[in-house]
Interface confidence: low
């Protein structure tokens, strides 16, 4: 069994005698081992530092020699613990171990911050055998270090399913300050305080921050990162940036624009998309939002008729989709329409007013005093009515629609007649005798068909009856008059 040696365990000597890469007492390498690719690293750290206590894992082999002496425990030799270098420099570091020759197929792997480094890394393992032991040197090189190479590196070796781990080698890549938080562009309310944050890291630390407003430094004394700049308020747009300083030099953040929120510009290009008798569909192009999102828009509608009372109808709608259907309008009327939109600061001015018109509407009133009587001699029903009091917006009367329903012995038949606008009477042929005829009349404009009049019923007797009288629209309160002739 292999057990873990404690710190007080005596390190096994590196090699029995001189070998390539062994150290002189001044710790200077006798020979730098070249990288497999031929790259000569800028920094080479040797495998041993005599006299330093060992803290890595140690495996104690239980195999005995001819004299039956147990072999000393296996452990990686001490090496450099901390490497500091500048960005883009090259570095090479290694770990070494002496393994008795009885162990075959030993492999060393490199790990960084707990994760095995596989594939695209420059790593090489070299073996130096001797009579009883083999010296193994695992080297790792980075041709141009970056901040992402910062971390703790270790070697691992497996022997008989036991793992031997080296002491860590800490790589610290120093360079210009690196921003972890830069100021962000903002839209702020005039004369209202706001904060900007800047944070940068080394190494090397410390990192000091200077703030710059419109190319001029704000603070004479630097602040340690992270720094929060409280701006008491602005009256006009400004550009802010921060400078981060450390021993390696200076890094400047991106410049950010701080805009002052204002009321929006008025919408433009208000246009009519569609018009009906009682609605107008409009669209508009929003103006500049004043650095604050549009909240909603207001559509203002005025009757363009000079005789109107000048009242304004206001319709509120969401800012999107720049489209609104104005309803509840009068037919055949002219309107002036303007649009205004608001953000958190306030309302824009109204867009340029545009003129729009609704189309003709259907009549709103049915024909009046509908009278129906039987002209038995000609076997016709005569219908008379009074023209409804049409409003101008109802459009021009183009005629009437007459509905007459004939009901007899369970049979019902509806017929429709269209008559011109000039008359106020019509004659329809008797369809069925011994039946009830129900008549309703509606006025018609180009805008549509208006409401039908209340029904007027008349009884059509069998042939030969002579007495008859007209049937007419009922007085209010009386429903469905029927005149039996």
């Amino acid at each position: 069994a292999i057990t873990e040696a404690r710190e007080e365990a005596k390190p096994y000597p590196l090699f029995p005698g001189p070998f390539p890469g062994s150290l002189q007492t001044d710790h200077t390498p006798l020979l730098s081992l070249p990288h497999a690719s031929g790259y000569q690293p800028a920094l080479m750290f040797s495998p041993t530092q005599p006299g330093r206590p060992h803290t890595g894992n140690v495996a104690i082999p239980q195999v005995t020699s001819v004299e039956s002496k147990p072999l000393p425990p296996l452990a990686f030799k001490h090496t450099v613990g901390h490497i500091i270098l500048s960005e883009h420099k090259g570095v090479k570091f290694n770990c070494s171990i002496s393994v008795p020759n009885i162990y075959q197929d030993t492999t060393i792997s490199w790990w960084k911050d707990g994760k095995e480094l596989l594939g695209a890394h420059h790593a090489i393992t070299q073996f130096y055998p001797d009579d009883e032991v083999t010296a193994i040197i695992a080297s790792f090189s980075i041709t141009s270090v970056q901040r992402s190479d910062n971390g703790s590196y270790i070697c691992k070796m497996k022997i008989n399913n036991e793992e031997i781990v080296s002491d860590p080698i800490y790589i610290e890549v120093q360079g210009l300050p690196h921003f972890t938080k830069q100021p962000e562009s903002m839209n702020v309310t005039r004369n209202t305080a706001f904060n900007l944050t800047c944070q940068a890291v080394g190494p090397p630390e410390p990192v000091n921050i200077f703030w710059v407003q419109n190319s001029s430094r704000v603070n004479e004394q630097p602040e340690k990162s992270p720094s929060v700049l409280t701006v008491p308020g602005l009256t006009e747009m400004a550009v802010f940036s921060c400078e981060a300083h450390n021993d390696k030099g200076l890094t400047v953040s991106k410049g950010v624009q701080i805009n002052i929120k204002a009321i929006p510009s008025p919408p433009t290009e208000v246009s009519i998309r569609n018009s009906t008798a009682h609605s107008i569909l409009i669209s508009w192009v929003p103006g500049f939002d004043g650095y604050s999102p549009f909240r909603n828009c207001s559509i203002q509608v005025k009757e363009a008729d000079p005789l109107s009372n000048g009242s304004v109808m206001i319709f509120n709608t969401s800012a999107l989709p720049h489209l609104y259907q104005i309803k509840q309008l009068q037919a055949l009327a002219n309107y002036s329409i303007g649009v205004s939109c608001m953000n958190e600061i306030g309302w824009s001015a109204v867009s340029p007013w545009i003129l729009a018109s609704t189309t003709e509407g259907a009549p709103s009133v049915a024909p009046l005093n509908v009278t129906v009587f039987l002209n038995e001699s000609s076997d016709n029903v005569d219908i008379r009515w009074m023209k409804p009091p049409t409003k101008q917006q109802d459009g021009e009367l183009v005629g009437y629609r007459i509905s007459h329903v004939w009901q007899s012995a369970g049979i019902s038949k509806e017929l429709l007649e269209e008559v011109g606008q000039n008359g106020s009477r019509a004659r329809i042929s008797v369809q069925v005798h011994n039946a009830t005829c129900t008549v309703r009349i509606a006025a018609v404009t180009r805008g549509g068909v208006g409401p039908f009049s209340d029904p007027v019923k008349i009884f059509i007797p069998a042939h030969g009856w002579v007495d008859y009288a007209p049937s007419s629209t009922p007085a209010p309160g009386n429903a469905d008059p029927v005149l039996i002739i």
Epitope: H278, M313, I314, F315, K327, Q328, V449, P451, F452
Partner: antibody, heavy 121, light 107 residues
Framework: QVTLRESGPGILQPSQTLSLTCSFS??????????VGWIRQSSGKGLKWLAH???????FYNPALKSRLTISKDTSKNQVFLKIANVDTTDTATYYC?????????????WGQGTPLIVSS | DIVMTQSQKIMSTSVGDRISVTCKAS??????VVWYQQKPGQSPKALIY???YRYSGVPDRFTGSRSGTDFTLTISNVQSEDLANYFC?????????FGSGTKLEIK
Amino acid sequence: QVTLRESGPGILQPSQTLSLTCSFSGFSLNTFGMGVGWIRQSSGKGLKWLAHIWWDDDKFYNPALKSRLTISKDTSKNQVFLKIANVDTTDTATYYCARIEGGLPYYYDYWGQGTPLIVSS
Amino acid sequence: DIVMTQSQKIMSTSVGDRISVTCKASQIVGTNVVWYQQKPGQSPKALIYSTSYRYSGVPDRFTGSRSGTDFTLTISNVQSEDLANYFCQQYNSYPFTFGSGTKLEIK
């Protein structure tokens, strides 16, 4: 959110006048296009529309009942009222108030829970 | 007045079925018809307005259509919670008028 609540006497005797109140929240009859109407439902006769009042005080009544109906509003209190004169047993029903938004005859999108009325001598 | 006729007083169906409730207007009402659902003990709730537009929050198994003055409410994949009375109403002209209602029973 929009809510409507009807209140009424519950029981009346024939020939009395029914007074109903609709109290609403979540909208205002000051707002262009808003309207509130009354509908009743009797067990045998389904739903019957009674009257409607718009934001601009325009009023509409069912012609069959017009002579007995009066609709009015108190915009500041968010209330609409309906009076039915000279009730008889055929007026026994559940009375609902409901809202129309849009300023034109349209569908009632929010209804109250209804208040029952029994007319009995 | 415009008469809205719902000839089916009661319709019986099973969960998962497709059912059509019809309503006939006595005269032209365009698309100005709304369908309401009224569950027992509740007030009516709008389902479909302007003939075919679903009111917000209404499941898409409810659809509306029209042919002339005949209006149809179709419920596909009927669920037990659809047990209710269904009314049509025209808002084409005053006085607004309602159908007499169709009661949907779940077998």
